[in-house]
Interface confidence: medium
């Protein structure tokens, strides 16, 4: 018996549409398929970024597939042909491996490149985006940002730079339709007619940086003779309600302090009818089932009562 | 750890339809392929459809081909079996399955060697 073999895929690479970090490999059948017309072939293609302890793999039909990566690092793919076993009376015969690398040949020394990159995405709304400049630099230097996700027809510079002694130092980024629950990709580069500036790449998803606005219309209720009830209203916005958690600080009599954490937008406290005071604040987070990660918004403001006995009125603010 | 459960099995007259639905959790790739196989009593398994999750890929065993039809709710991470013109020798327990590494559905003669994680199964009787 003649041993089976199958040629690698021909002409694989990994191609740059220029979306910042958002690649496609592809390639062609391998030589020499005329023996396995009957065959419908497979390729297992195994991918990642240099330096990541585990490849990432895939097996598919197709001649292409495409991937975000960190392009700050190089990547490096390795692809072979798969012959399922009704092909060859037997078990599965695997191809040897095409290799091929990418990365984006870097200018300047690590250090230009913008440093505490930090983006918000204030209450659902308002993506903005802060950098420092990179150690060093003199003050000709200018960074630029530029951004893609899925959607976009090609990546879009910013178009209003938050600026400090004439330097770009952030983006308020414009409305973003339907952004959230996908990649989003950041570039920001940099020139200085002295020396070259290393461009920097970052990726995230929106709905894991949101910081809301915080709780509303704090307001008591006295349930029993021992029992108070504290109320507040999700903020103005996008946000639905069963996306938030929430953090009560709670001080009585300037003495106790409790902290809790609540899904919903009461709380019950236990109390002595000899309480004078009582105030309370409330934060707001998205919370696990809208997104992996969220931003604490700021505190409320204090809601308070004091000098009048909570049985008899209920406080609005 | 992927989980897959499935729903919609039942008692069925000939002629008659039903969707089975199967929802996946516990895995983290945007990638994948789901299948739903059968086996009648007495028999083997064998593979009935299977769908991407990304591509407009599907494929079906010759003997539910124009009567059941595969579809996807990616949002939800669920797949349908939609079995209409259904006969007697389509009773069986329907088991729905994943493998999280192909991105294109294989041959349907050789799909039960290529999922790795199963559920646990949901009985369709087609009988008057």
């Known amino acids: 018996d003649t041993e089976i073999k199958v040629n690698p895929p021909q002409d694989f690479e990994i191609v740059d549409p220029g979306y910042l970090g958002y690649l496609y490999l592809q390639w062609q059948p391998p030589l020499s398929l005329d023996h396995f017309k009957e065959c419908t072939v497979e390729y297992e293609l195994k991918y990642r970024n240099i330096g990541s302890e585990t490849w990432k793999t895939i097996i598919t039909k197709n001649l292409h597939y495409k991937d975000g990566f960190d392009l700050n690092k190089g990547i490096e793919a390795k692809i072979h042909t798969l012959l399922p076993w009704q092909c060859t009376n037997g078990s599965e015969v695997q191809s040897s491996w095409a290799e091929t690398t990418y990365w984006i040949s870097p200018q300047g020394i690590p250090e230009t490149k913008v440093q505490d990159m930090d983006c918000v995405y204030y209450n659902w709304q308002y993506l903005l985006c802060s950098w420092k400049p990179g150690i060093g630099v003199l003050l000709d230097t200018n960074y630029n940002l530029f951004y893609w996700y899925e959607g976009l027809d090609h990546a879009l510079q910013c178009v209003d730079y938050i600026k400090a002694d004439g330097q770009n130092i952030g983006c308020r980024f414009p409305y973003l339709e339907a952004s959230d629950y996908k990649d989003f990709y950041i570039c920001v580069n940099g020139s200085s007619e002295n020396k070259p500036i290393r461009s920097s790449y970052f990726t995230f998803q929106l709905q894991n940086i949101v910081k809301p606005l915080p709780p509303v219309y704090l307001t008591f209720t006295r349930e029993s003779s021992c029992e108070i009830k504290l109320k507040w209203s999700i903020p103005l916005g996008p946000i639905p309600a069963r996306c938030f958690d929430y953090e009560i600080e709670i001080r009585e009599d300037d003495t106790t302090l409790v902290t809790a954490t609540v899904e919903n937008e009461t709380y019950t406290l236990k109390t002595t009818n000899e309480t004078r005071q009582l105030c309370f604040v409330v934060r707001s987070k998205v919370n696990i089932y809208c997104s992996d990660d969220g931003i604490w918004s700021e505190w409320s403001d204090k809601q308070c009562w004091e000098g009048e006995d909570l049985s008899k009125k209920t406080l609005l603010r | 750890e992927v989980q897959l459960v499935e729903s919609g099995g039942g008692l069925v007259q000939p002629g008659g339809s039903l969707r089975l639905s199967c929802a996946a959790s516990g895995f983290a790739s945007d990638d994948y392929i789901m299948g739903w196989f059968r086996q009648a009593p007495g028999k083997g398994l064998e593979g009935v459809s299977c769908i991407s999750s990304r591509y407009a890929n599907t494929v079906y065993a010759d003997s539910v081909k124009g009567r059941f039809t595969i579809s996807r709710d990616n949002a939800k991470n669920t797949v349908y079996l939609q079995m209409n013109s259904l006969r007697p020798e389509d009773t069986a327990v329907y088991y729905c399955?994943?493998?999280?590494?192909?991105?294109?559905?294989?041959?349907?003669?050789?799909?039960?060697?290529?999922?790795?994680?199963w559920g646990q199964g949901t009985q369709v009787t087609v009988s008057s």
């Open positions: 399955a994943m493998d999280s590494r192909r991105v294109t559905c294989p041959e349907i003669s050789t799909m039960h060697r290529n999922f790795d994680s």
